[in-house]
Interface confidence: low
């Protein structure tokens, strides 16, 4: 069972349902309308924003656009058909794909990634497919909070 519990707090971005708890014994607590998985919290948007707008929204929630640790990180979203902005963009300065925190993309995460013609920002879906798009395109997005 994934470590998860819902926390009865009201996040800044919405007057979300004030859900009562039967608190699990495990380690994770997530705001309402956030999803807990493997001791991380994810906000999976239903609205669309540009990559920068998405990044700013996540920052306002004390989180960041999703930085994938491995390709199965979004297994819990297997039923979703949508592409979502993640925290990966192309740095002209470094001629490399960098995560929001400045770290480089692992060659093992997307083995065929070098065949992409960079369009600056990356959208990702739960099937493990990555799509490079103009950062001004509006997509859904995923924010991630690491709890431990």
């Amino acid at each position: 069972k994934n470590s998860f519990t819902k926390l009865s707090v009201e996040p800044a971005y919405t007057p979300g349902p004030n859900i009562e708890l039967q608190k699990d014994s495990d380690c994770c607590s997530c705001h309402e309308k956030w999803v807990g998985y493997r001791c991380n919290c994810y906000f999976i948007s239903s609205e669309e924003k540009t990559w920068n707008e998405s990044r700013h929204f996540c920052a306002s929630q004390k989180s960041s656009l999703l930085q994938l640790q491995n390709r199965d990180e979004l297994d819990f979203m297997s039923s979703s058909q949508h592409f979502y902005w993640i925290g990966l963009s192309y740095s002209e300065e470094h001629t490399a794909w960098l995560w929001e925190n400045g770290s480089a993309l692992s060659q093992y995460l997307f083995p065929s990634f070098e065949t992409f013609k960079p369009k600056n920002c990356i959208a990702y879906n739960s099937k493990g497919n990555a799509l490079d798009e103009s950062c001004e395109t509006k997509n859904r997005y995923i924010c991630k909070q690491q709890l431990i």
């Epitope: 994934n2 519990t5 007057p15 349902p17 859900i19 309308k33 999976i44 819990f76 979703s80």
Partner: antibody
Framework: QVQLQQSGPGLVKPSETLSLTCTVS??????????WGWIRQPPGKGLEWIGS???????YYNPSLKSRVTISVDTSKNQFSLNLSSVTAADTAVYYC?????????????WGQGTMVTVSS | EIVLTQSPATLSLSPGERATLSCRAS??????LAWFQQKPGQAPRLLIY???SRATGIPDRFSGSGSGTDFTLTISRLEPEDFAVYYC?????????FGQGTRLEIK
């Protein structure tokens, strides 16, 4: 695609406990992006949310019914259940189970077929 | 709890006409509002979530608008199968609540 199949008695005696079960097919009840809920509708009236449950067992209930409601989940059987104790004629209604996504929408998107429950001696 | 008031209680229109249904919340629910359609003997069907996003498979003649406390469901051109009862539901604050419904009937 996901479907919800309800089962349980259609007649319950006053003061007894109403018990209904909702079986999820075409998907896993253990998906972490869904809550599962119960809603009821008295004859000729509107909808009333009863409560919801997460696969981990976390629940939240309508305060107006909280003292009498227990919702439980059995992940091994891919089903969740409603128990409503000390029923009266006012609990006569069609009871629905439904899925509540956590992917931004947070609105009941898939419903069971409904079970008409009559409280009568 | 947040009370949702729907108006009118009954709306009588003819096929091909435009229907406008209103839902007013007793306090702000942001855009956490959904609309459902229910036909006799059937379970409700989700039409709109997030005040304005159409659910999967819902025809584009259905549209939702509004935020805060005032919301509208519009059916641009009524089809015979659209005559039913419509409910709004808020999920911005617990407990989740529904409006009392608007019956859309054939004139």
């Amino acid at each position: 695609q996901v479907q919800l199949q309800q089962s349980g008695p259609g007649l319950v005696k006053p003061s007894e406990t109403l018990s209904l079960t909702c079986t999820v097919s075409g998907g896993s009840i253990s998906s972490i992006i869904y809550y599962w809920g119960w809603i009821r509708q008295p004859p000729g009236k509107g909808l009333e949310w009863i409560g919801s449950i997460y696969y981990s067992g976390s629940t939240y209930y309508n305060p107006s019914l909280k003292s009498r409601v227990t919702i439980s989940v059995d992940t091994s059987k891919n089903q969740f259940s409603l128990n409503l104790s000390s029923v009266t004629a006012a609990d006569t209604a069609v009871y629905y189970c439904a899925r509540l996504p956590l992917t931004g929408e947070f609105a009941f998107d898939i419903w069971g077929q409904g079970t008409m429950v009559t409280v009568s001696s | 709890e947040i009370v949702l008031t729907q108006s009118p209680a009954t709306l009588s229109l003819s096929p091909g006409e435009r229907a406008t249904l209103s839902c007013r919340a007793s306090q702000s629910v942001s855009t956490y509002l959904a609309w459902f359609q229910q036909k006799p003997g059937q379970a409700p069907r989700l039409l709109i979530y997030g005040a304005s996003s159409r659910a999967t498979g819902i025809p584009d003649r259905f549209s939702g608008s509004g935020s805060g406390t005032d919301f509208t469901l519009t059916i641009s051109r009524l089809e015979p199968e659209d005559f039913a009862v419509y409910y709004c539901q808020q999920y911005g604050s617990s407990p989740i609540t529904f409006g009392q419904g608007t019956r859309l009937e054939i004139k």
